[in-house]
């Protein structure tokens, strides 16, 4: 399986909400011993390998934000914890999954990573991620709404699997 990022850059005004999206592509093993986790975390630019470093999103770890199920099932976080931080992650039956961030501030700017982890027999993990940048702007140069910039076809299919 692969992860595609439809948009590589989101430029948003302060105070706006944004939904960052990723899509799980390709065949997904629906065996009874396979569990899929989809989650999000922050990372930083300038690494040897994108998304290798991980940091929390608004103080929430990837475990606080994850969805887990078998295959292409729909799910969403109903965590009070996430919603108290203005966050909600969700996924649908078509492999799309997202994180919505409410009331953006300049501190939310940075690199975001979506991650899909396949676990077999509750043992080791096979993981694939996608990366996108969020720029939160303020002042007269800020857009009135979020502007999204599509990934190049190469980028959106550029898969980093560990």
């Amino acid at each position: 399986f692969k992860v595609a990022t439809p948009y590589s850059l989101y430029v948003c005004p302060e105070g706006q909400n944004v939904t960052l999206t990723c899509r799980l592509l390709g065949p997904v093993d629906k065996g009874h011993d396979v569990t899929f986790y989809k989650t999000w975390y922050r990372s930083s630019r300038g690494e040897v390998q994108t998304c290798s470093e991980r940091r929390p999103i608004r103080n929430l770890t990837f475990q606080d934000l994850h969805l887990h199920h078998g295959g292409h099932q729909a799910a969403n976080t109903s965590h009070d914890l996430a919603q108290r931080h203005g966050l909600e992650s969700a996924s649908d039956h078509h492999g799309n999954f997202s994180i919505t961030m409410r009331n953006l501030t300049l501190l939310d700017s940075g690199l975001y990573c979506c991650l899909v982890v396949e676990i077999r027999h509750h043992h080791s993990e096979h993981r694939v991620h996608g990366a996108m940048e969020l720029q939160v702007q303020t002042g007269k140069d800020a857009p009135s709404n979020c502007v999204v910039y599509p990934s190049s076809s190469q980028d959106s299919e550029n898969i980093t699997a560990a």
Partner: antibody, heavy 121, light 112 residues
Framework: QVQLVQSGAEVKKPGASVKVSCKAS????????INWVRQAPGQGLEWMGR????????YYNEKFKDRVTMTRDTSTSTVYMELSSLRSEDTAVYYC??????????????WGQGTTVTVSS | EIVMTQSPATLSVSPGERATLSCKSS????????????LAWYQQKPGQAPRLLIY???TRESGIPARFSGSGSGTEFTLTISSLQSEDFAVYYC????????FGGGTKVEIK
């Protein structure tokens, strides 16, 4: 840089408990598992368990599950490993080590310097 | 549990020579989904903590000299040190991370 610094050597009597600390720096403490691995004198490495500092959830090797407790203090980025009902066979160097897994298992990329625990009457 | 067996227990080699260390697992550590071997190698010098050398059976950790190489797949793995330097005399451990964590008993590489 990423670093794990452990507490100093301990000498304990059989039946007592020992609590070893491991202070992390240089990375997001809450987002990476910390493992404990021990090494008896002249012996190999033995995995004891691990803790995810973000949640405090701990997972133990069956061999140690009745005697070991792993905790964390996010305010000081420190993980603790307490081993109770000590016996002479627990004399070993205890290491903390970070792993890079999300939900499964991974290799250990950073290690503490080790803490020597001696159990002797 | 997956049992890791290393051989030989001690290897006597002269500086500049090649050292070949073996590690065998009681079951395959190859993960079908990504065709990766969940095996790492560590070096440990006296009084020091282990140091990661190799992961995924053959990928060198950043900063590790090119004279260290890993190979093998499934259940049989090899760590090769192409030309031993004085600082390479140490104990080497293999480690599987496919199913929980287990280590081999170690191979001590000593000066001949």
């Amino acid at each position: 840089q990423v670093q794990l610094v452990q507490s100093g050597a301990e000498v304990k009597k059989p039946g007592a408990s020992v609590k070893v600390s491991c202070k992390a720096s240089g990375y997001s403490f809450t987002d990476y598992y910390i493992n404990w691995v021990r090494q008896a004198p002249g012996q190999g490495l033995e995995w004891m368990g691990r803790i995810f500092p973000g949640s405090g959830n701990a997972y133990y090797n069956e061999k140690f599950k009745d005697r070991v407790t792993m905790t964390r203090d996010t305010s000081t980025s420190t993980v603790y490993m307490e081993l109770s009902s000590l016996r002479s066979e627990d004399t070993a160097v205890y290491y903390c080590a970070r792993d890079d897994s999300f939900y499964g298992y991974w290799y250990f990329d950073v290690w503490g310097q080790g803490t020597t625990v001696t159990v002797s009457s | 549990e997956i049992v890791m067996t290393q051989s030989p227990a001690t290897l006597s080699v002269s500086p500049g020579e090649r050292a070949t260390l073996s590690c065998k697992s009681s079951q395959s550590v190859l993960y079908s989904s990504n065709q990766k071997n969940y095996l790492a190698w560590y070096q440990q010098k006296p009084g020091q903590a282990p140091r990661l050398l190799i992961y995924w059976a053959s990928t060198r950790e950043s900063g590790i000299p090119a004279r260290f190489s890993g190979s093998g797949s499934g259940t049989e793995f090899t760590l090769t040190i192409s030309s031993l330097q004085s600082e390479d005399f140490a104990v080497y451990y293999c480690h599987q991370y496919l199913s929980s964590y287990t280590f081999g008993g170690g191979t001590k590489v000593e000066i001949k």
